[in-house]
C-alpha cells in the first residue's frame, strides 16, 4: 500500500516516500523504485540552507556598496551573505537592505548607546547636572563642573546644554 | 516507471536543423531535468545539455552552445532538443535521459546529416 | 570540459574479475561524488549500473562495484559472465551544471 506519510527529511511523490536534498544541494530528479533521489550542489555564489526539494539554488545576497553595504560574513552553499554598513552607517531593517547614517544626538542630548552596523544612535536627554553642548553621535552627557572642588563659587547655572560658569568667591572686605 | 519515448529517424541536409522530442510517461513530469546525449556511429557517449521541465531553465555544453535548444512542452510532457547549422559530422544516434545521473533512457533518435 | 580518460579495451574470462578505470581532474571527479558508469550492448541504449560513485541501482547485480581516489574512479566487475560483454562508460558532474563523460572502455570476455 502506498504511504500517505513520509518520514522527517522525506516527501511523497508518486505514492512513494524520497529523500529531500541536503542544505547545498538542489533536486534534479525524484527518487524511483530504482534509485535515489538525484541532488546537485549549488553552484557558485547559490545557496540554500535547508533540507529541501528545490530545483533552484537562491543566489547569495549581493552587498551593494552604493547602498553603503559591506560584506560581513561570506556565504556558502549553505548560507547566504550577511552583509552590514560601512562605519559611520547601520541597516535600516533587520535584512540589512541599505543602510543610513548614524544619527547624532542634539545639543541637550547625550549618547546612551553607540551606534553599530545594525542599530542607530540611542540618544537621551541630559538629566539635572548633566549636559551636552555639541552634535554628536559618540558624546555622552557631561557632568557639570563642580565649582566647590576647585574653590570657586557657581556664576551661571548650568543647562542641559550648557556646562555651569564658576568664578572667585567674594572676599569679605 | 519513468518512460521516455522519443521521435522517428531523421535524414537532414548540411546546414538545415532538425529537433528532435522526448515523450515522458510514468512519474511527474515537472520533477526531473532531462539530459541529452549523443553517439556518433563506433564512437562514444557525449553530453549535450540539460533542460529542467519544473521552470525550463537550461544548460547547455560548451561545445554546442549557440547550436542548440532545449525546450519542454509541459501540457504533453514532452522536451525538445533542436540543433542547428548541421554538418556531416553530426550524424548520430541522439538520446534523451532522466536526469545528470541519466537513469532512464530513450531508445535514440538517429539522425543522418548528408547531402 | 575535455573528456573523462578511460581504457579504451579491457578483459577477462568468465568468473575473473576486471577492473575500469576512469581518470579525471579536480574539477569533475575529484571535486564531486557524482560519478555514475553506464553498460551499453551493441545497438542498445546505454544502462545506469553504478551512481554516486558506488551507489547501484536497484536490480542490478553486486558484481558490479566501483569506488573513488582522488581524480580516478574505478569500475570492477567480478564473477564475468559472457553477457558482461560491452561498452562501458563513465560519467562525472563537473559542476556548474555541466556533465562530462569517458571515452568508453570495451570489456571482452574471453573464451
Known amino acids: 500500500e502506498p504511504p500517505t506519510a513520509c518520514r522527517e527529511k522525506q516527501y511523497l511523490i508518486n505514492s512513494q516516500c524520497c529523500s529531500l536534498c541536503q542544505p547545498g544541494q538542489k533536486l534534479v530528479s525524484d527518487c524511483t523504485e530504482f534509485t535515489e533521489t538525484e541532488c546537485l550542489p549549488c553552484g557558485e555564489s547559490e545557496f540554500l540552507d535547508t533540507w529541501n526539494r528545490e530545483t533552484h539554488c537562491h543566489q547569495h545576497k549581493y552587498c551593494d556598496p552604493n547602498l553603503g553595504l559591506r560584506v560581513q560574513q561570506k556565504g556558502t552553499s549553505e548560507t547566504d551573505t550577511i552583509c552590514t554598513c560601512e562605519e559611520g552607517w547601520h541597516c535600516t531593517s533587520e535584512a540589512c537592505e541599505s543602510c543610513v547614517l548614524h544619527r547624532s544626538c542634539s545639543p541637550g542630548f547625550g549618547v546612551k548607546q553607540i551606534a553599530t552596523g545594525v542599530s542607530d544612535t540611542i540618544c537621551e536627554p541630559c538629566p539635572v547636572g548633566f549636559f551636552s553642548n555639541v552634535s554628536s553621535a559618540f558624546e555622552k552627557c557631561h557632568p557639570w563642573t563642580s565649582c566647590e572642588t576647585k574653590d570657586l563659587v557657581v556664576q551661571q547655572a548650568g543647562t542641559n546644554k550648557t556646562d555651569v560658569v564658576c568664578g572667585p568667591q567674594d572676599r569679605l572686605r | 516507471q519513468v518512460q521516455l519515448v522519443q521521435s522517428g529517424a531523421e535524414v537532414k541536409k548540411p546546414g538545415s536543423s532538425v529537433k528532435v522530442s522526448c515523450k515522458a510517461s510514468g512519474g511527474t513530469f515537472s520533477s526531473y531535468a532531462v539530459s541529452w546525449v549523443r553517439q556518433a556511429p563506433g564512437q562514444g557517449l557525449e553530453w549535450m545539455g540539460m533542460i529542467n521541465p519544473s521552470g525550463g531553465t537550461t544548460s547547455y555544453a560548451q561545445k554546442f552552445q549557440g547550436r542548440v535548444t532545449m525546450t519542454r512542452d509541459t501540457s504533453t510532457s514532452t522536451v525538445y532538443m533542436e540543433l542547428s547549422s548541421l554538418r556531416p559530422e553530426d550524424t548520430a544516434v541522439y538520446y534523451c535521459?532522466?536526469?545528470?545521473?541519466?537513469?532512464?533512457w530513450g531508445q535514440g533518435t538517429l539522425v543522418t546529416v548528408s547531402s | 570540459q575535455s573528456a573523462l580518460t578511460q581504457p579504451p579495451s579491457a578483459s577477462g574470462s568468465p568468473g575473473q574479475s576486471v577492473t575500469i578505470s576512469c581518470t579525471g581532474t579536480?574539477?569533475?571527479?575529484?571535486?564531486?561524488?557524482?560519478v555514475s558508469w553506464y553498460q551499453q550492448h551493441p545497438g542498445n541504449a546505454p544502462k545506469l549500473i553504478i551512481y554516486d560513485v558506488r551507489k547501484r541501482p536497484r536490480g542490478i547485480p553486486d558484481r558490479f562495484s566501483a569506488s573513488k581516489s582522488g581524480n580516478t574512479a574505478s569500475l570492477t566487475v567480478s564473477g564475468l559472465q559472457a553477457d558482461d560483454e560491452a561498452d562501458y562508460y563513465c560519467s562525472s558532474y563537473a559542476g556548474n551544471n555541466n556533465l562530462v563523460f569517458g571515452g568508453g572502455t570495451k570489456l571482452t570476455v574471453l573464451g
Open positions: 579536480s574539477s569533475d571527479v575529484g571535486a564531486y561524488n557524482f
Open positions: 535521459a532522466r536526469g545528470f545521473r541519466m537513469d532512464q
